[in-house]
Interface confidence: low
C-alpha cells in the first residue's frame, strides 16, 4: 500500500524508540568512523523531521524516499572527505546509486580501537546517570564494528543488555552478576553478526536465488509439516526482510520482520507445533525465538521421494514447465526428510539433481538417463560425514586449544599469504566447531558443524575480499557458495609459496604477556605459531609441537621470575636460537 510519507509510515509503525535506535544503527553502519555525538545529533534531526511528517504527511520533503532523506543527512557531515576519503564521492551521486555506493564502502574490519570493558562500578554509574545515552552508545559501538549486524536483532541484544544492567547494578556482587551476562552477550553477538554476514554475502555475491534456496532448505528442515506453499510464502517474506537489512533499509526490515513474526504466529497450526511458546513472547523476543526455534517433528506419512523425482516419467515435463518451482519442491521434499543434513549439503544435492536434469532432459531416453541420480548423492553425503567424524575424533583427543592449533597449521599451509591476524581469528573460530558440535548425537552433528563452518569461512572470504592476497582463497570464495567448505578442505600445502624472511622481532616477547587473560595469551602463542609456519611451511607436526612446548615453558618460567623483563629478554634469545636450530631456519 502506498503511503504519502514513507518516513511517517515507518515512524508510526515502529514507534519513536525503535525508530531512533534503527536510524542510529543505520548511520553508524554507514559512517563507521564518526564520533558518537555526531551520530546522535543526526538521529535527533531525522527524528524531529519524521515527527513533522507524522503531523502532516504533505509537509515539505515528507514524500522523499528514506534513502534520499538519510543519504542527504549523511552527506551533511562536514569531515566526510578527510575521514572517509573516496566515500565522499558517493554524495555526488543520485539515488539509488548513492546508497549502493555507501553500501560498497562498508568496512568489515574497520580500523577502530578494541572495545575495553570498564570496571563494573564505572559502568553501573554511567548506566544510572544516563540510561538512554548508555544504551545508545552500545548500539553505536556494535553497529560501527559490525556494519551488517541484523538491526532488529541488535534491538533485542540491547534489550538484554539493559536488563543485565538493571538487574546486576542492584546486586550485592555486581561483577559476579554482570560479567557472565556481558560475556554471553558478546559471544552471542559475534555469532549473530557472523551468521548475518553470510546471509548478506549470499544475497550480494550470489543473488536472491541462492538465498531463497538456502531459506527453502532451512525452513523445510525447521517446519517439515508445513506445506510447500506455506514454506514458499515464508521464504519470499524472509528474503524481503534480509534483502532490506543487507541493503541498509533498516526501518523497512524491522517493520517487515515484525509482520512476518505476526503472520507466523497467526498461522502456527499450518507451520509448526514448536512455535507456541515463542508466540507468547513480546515482539523482539518473539522474532528471536522464532528464528532459533527447534525443528518440528517430521510427518510420519511422507511418500517415497523417488516416486515424484526419479520414477515418474513426467520429471522432465514438470521440470520444463517451471524449473525453479520444481527444484524448490525437490529441495523442500529432501530437506524436510533430512534434518540430519547440513543446509549446504542439501543445496549440493539439489544442484546435482538440477545438473542431471539439465543433461538428461535433452537426452534420447531421459528416464533412463536420470534413473540413477540418487546414487550420485551418496559420495556427496559421505564426504562431510567422514570429515566431521575425523575432526571430532581429533578434537576429543586434543581439546579445543590444541585442536585450534592443528587447524592453524593446516590453514596456514593451505593459504600462507593471508594475514596472520585473519588466520588466527578464522582458525580459532573453525576450532570452536569441536566444542559447539561434537557433543551432539550423529543426527545433529552435520547441520551444526558444516553450517557453522560456512559462517566462519565467510568471515575469511569477506576479510580477504578487502585486501586480496591469495588466488586460492578468491577461487574458493567466489566459485560456489555451497562448495566453499569442500573447496578449502581440498586445498593442499601451497607449493608456490616463498617462505617468509625470518624476523627475530616477531618472536620477541615481553612481561606484559603475563598479565593477559588466558584467551589473550593463547592468541599470542597462536600468532607465533602462524608466523613459524610462514617461515617454515614444510615443518612437521612434531617439530612445531616441540617449538610450541618450549615456548609455553618459556612463558611460564618468565612469568614466575622475579625480574620478568630480563628473563624474557635473555631466555627469549635462547628460545629463538633453539627454535631456529630445531626448524633448520
Amino acid at each position: 500500500d502506498a503511503h504519502k510519507s514513507e518516513v511517517a509510515h515507518r515512524f508510526k509503525d515502529l514507534g519513536e524508540e525503535n525508530f531512533k535506535a534503527l536510524v542510529l544503527i543505520a548511520f553508524a553502519q554507514y559512517l563507521q568512523q564518526c564520533p558518537f555525538e555526531d551520530h546522535v545529533k543526526l538521529v535527533n534531526e531525522v527524528t524531529e523531521f519524521a515527527k513533522t511528517c507524522v503531523a502532516d504527511e504533505s509537509a515539505e520533503n515528507c514524500d522523499k524516499s528514506l534513502h534520499t532523506l538519510f543519504g542527504d543527512k549523511l552527506c551533511t557531515v562536514a569531515t566526510l572527505r578527510e575521514t572517509y576519503g573516496e566515500m565522499a564521492d558517493c554524495c555526488a551521486k543520485q539515488e539509488p546509486e548513492r546508497n549502493e555506493c555507501f553500501l560498497q564502502h562498508k568496512d568489515d574490519n574497520p580500523n577502530l580501537p578494541r572495545l575495553v570493558r570498564p570496571e563494573v562500578d564505572v559502568m553501573c554509574t554511567a548506566f544510572h546517570d544516563n540510561e538512554e545515552t548508555f544504551l545508545k552508545k552500545y548500539l553505536y559501538e556494535i553497529a560501527r564494528r559490525h556494519p551488517y549486524f541484523y538491526a532488529p536483532e541488535l534491538l533485542f541484544f540491547a534489550k538484554r543488555y539493559k536488563a543485565a544492567f538493571t538487574e546486576c547494578c542492584q546486586a550485592a556482587d555486581k561483577a559476579a552478576c554482570l560479567l557472565p551476562k556481558l560475556d554471553e552477550l558478546r559471544d552471542e553477538g559475534k555469532a549473530s553478526s557472523a551468521k548475518q554476514r553470510l546471509k548478506c554475502a549470499s544475497l550480494q555475491k550470489f543473488g536472491e536465488r541462492a538465498f531463497k534456496a538456502w531459506a527453502v532448505a532451512r525452513l523445510s528442515q525447521r517446519f517439515p509439516k508445513a506445506e510447500f506453499a506455506e514454506v514458499s510464502k515464508l521464504v519470499t517474506d524472509l528474503t524481503k526482510v534480509h534483502t532490506e537489512c543487507c541493503h541498509g533499509d533498516l526501518l523497512e526490515c524491522a517493520d517487515d520482520r515484525a509482520d512476518l513474526a505476526k503472520y507466523i504466529c497467526e498461522n502456527q497450526d499450518s507451520i509448526s507445533s514448536k512455535l507456541k511458546e515463542c508466540c507468547e513472547k513480546p515482539l523482539l523476543e518473539k522474532s528471536h525465538c522464532i528464528a532459533e526455534v527447534e525443528n518440528d517433528e517430521m510427518p510420519a506419512d511422507l511418500p517415497s521421494l523417488a516416486a515424484d523425482f526419479v520414477e515418474s516419467k513426467d520429471v522432465c515435463k514438470n521440470y520444463a514447465e517451471a524449473k525453479d518451482v520444481f527444484l524448490g519442491m525437490f529441495l523442500y521434499e529432501y530437506a524436510r526428510r533430512h534434518p540430519d543434513y547440513s543446509v549446504v549439503l542439501l543445496l549440493r544435492l539439489a544442484k546435482t539433481y538440477e545438473t542431471t536434469l539439465e543433461k538428461c532432459c535433452a537426452a534420447a531416453d531421459p528416464h533412463e538417463c536420470y534413473a540413477k541420480v540418487f546414487d550420485e548423492f551418496k559420495p556427496l553425503v559421505e564426504e562431510p560425514q567422514n570429515l566431521i567424524k575425523q575432526n571430532c575424533e581429533l578434537f576429543e583427543q586434543l581439546g579445543e586449544y590444541k585442536f585450534q592449533n592443528a587447524l592453524l597449521v593446516r590453514y596456514t599451509k593451505k593459504v600462507p599469504q593471508v594475514s596472520t591476524p585473519t588466520l588466527v581469528e578464522v582458525s580459532r573460530n573453525l576450532g570452536k566447531v569441536g566444542s559447539k558440535c561434537c557433543k551432539h548425537p550423529e543426527a545433529k552433528r552435520m547441520p551444526c558443524a558444516e553450517d557453522y563452518l560456512s559462517v566462519v569461512l565467510n568471515q575469511l572470504c569477506v576479510l580477504h575480499e578487502k585486501t586480496p592476497v591469495s588466488d586460492r582463497v578468491t577461487k574458493c570464495c567466489t566459485e560456489s557458495l555451497v562448495n566453499r567448505r569442500p573447496c578449502f578442505s581440498a586445498l593442499e600445502v601451497d607449493e608456490t609459496y616463498v617462505p617468509k624472511e625470518f624476523n627475530a622481532e616477531t618472536f620477541t616477547f615481553h612481561a606484559d604477556i603475563c598479565t593477559l587473560s588466558e584467551k589473550e595469551r593463547q592468541i599470542k602463542k597462536q600468532t607465533a605459531l602462524v608466523e613459524l609456519v610462514k617461515h617454515k611451511p614444510k615443518a612437521t607436526k612434531e617439530q612445531l609441537k616441540a617449538v610450541m612446548d618450549d615456548f609455553a615453558a618459556f612463558v611460564e618460567k618468565c612469568c614466575k621470575a622475579d625480574d620478568k623483563e630480563t628473563c624474557f629478554a635473555e631466555e627469549g634469545k635462547k628460545l629463538v636460537a633453539a627454535s631456529q636450530a630445531a626448524l633448520g631456519l
Partner: antibody, heavy 120, light 108 residues
C-alpha cells in the same frame, strides 16, 4: 470461498466407461495434491486415487488399479477420474478431496459428490 | 496392505465424554486424521495430524496417537455431534491412503 464441485456421474452398464470431473476454486489448485474418495450406499469411505501437484505421479487403490486413471489440468483448475471396465461394485458417491502439498492426507476440503451407478 | 480397525458404534450421554479408537499396526508412527460425516453430507476433517484441530472445529474435539491406537475424544458431547467418524492414515509402503471402517457415535 474454497469450492470443489464434482460432475459427470450417471448410470453406466458394467464394462462401460465414464469420466467424472471436479472443478476447484478459491485456492491455488496447482499447489495441492488432489484425491478421489468414494462411498458405496450404506458403506464407509474408500480412497480411490491421488495425484501430485504437477500431475506427474499418480496413486491408486488396489481395487481400481489398471482400470481408473486420475489426471488434472492445472490451467483449468480441474481434476478428472477416467473410469473404464466398470463393475457393479464401483457403484458409489464419488467425492473430490483436497489433500496436502506432498503428503496426500488429510483431506481438508471435500466436494458434495457425484453419483456413479453401474448396473445393467 | 495396511488395515485400520474401528468399533462400529459408540454411545455417549449428552455432555459426557466419548472416545472413538482406531487400531493399526504401529499407527503412532503415522499421521492420523479424523473425519465426521452426517447423513446426506460430505465428510468434514475434524482432526488432522493426530491432534490438530482445523479452524471452525469446536474445542471439544481432540485427538491423540501412540503405539497401536489413535483416539478421537469428544469432551462434553452435543446432540449435533451424532455422526459417523472415520480415521485415515497414509500407508507409505503401499503409497495409498487408508480409511477405517467408521464408527457411529450416538449421543443419548
Amino acid at each position: 470461498e474454497l469450492q470443489l464441485v464434482e460432475s459427470g456421474g450417471g448410470l453406466v452398464q458394467p464394462g462401460g466407461s465414464l469420466r467424472v470431473s471436479c472443478a476447484a476454486s478459491g485456492f491455488t489448485f496447482s499447489h495441492y495434491y488432489m484425491n478421489w474418495v468414494r462411498q458405496a450406499p450404506g458403506k464407509g469411505l474408500e480412497w480411490v486415487s491421488g495425484i501430485n501437484t504437477g500431475g506427474g505421479t499418480t496413486y491408486y487403490a488396489d481395487s481400481v488399479k489398471g482400470r481408473f486413471t486420475i489426471s488434472r489440468d492445472n490451467a483449468k483448475n480441474t481434476l478428472y477420474l477416467q473410469m473404464n471396465s466398470l463393475k457393479p461394485e464401483d457403484t458409489a458417491l464419488y467425492y473430490c478431496a483436497k489433500g496436502g502439498i506432498v503428503a496426500v492426507g488429510g483431506f481438508g476440503s471435500w466436494g458434495q459428490g457425484t453419483q456413479v451407478t453401474v448396473s445393467s | 496392505s495396511y488395515e485400520l480397525t474401528q468399533s462400529p458404534s459408540v454411545s455417549v450421554a449428552l455432555r459426557q465424554t466419548a472416545k472413538i479408537t482406531c487400531g493399526g499396526d504401529n499407527i503412532g508412527s503415522k499421521n492420523a486424521h479424523w473425519y465426521q460425516q452426517k447423513p446426506g453430507q460430505a465428510p468434514v476433517l475434524v482432526i488432522y495430524k493426530d491432534s490438530n484441530r482445523p479452524s471452525g472445529i469446536p474445542e471439544r474435539f481432540s485427538g491423540s496417537n501412540s503405539g497401536n491406537t489413535a483416539t478421537l475424544t469428544v469432551s462434553g458431547a452435543q446432540a449435533e455431534d451424532e455422526a459417523d467418524y472415520y480415521c485415515q492414515v497414509w500407508d507409505s509402503s503401499a503409497n495409498a491412503a487408508v480409511f477405517g471402517g467408521g464408527t457411529h457415535l450416538t449421543v443419548l
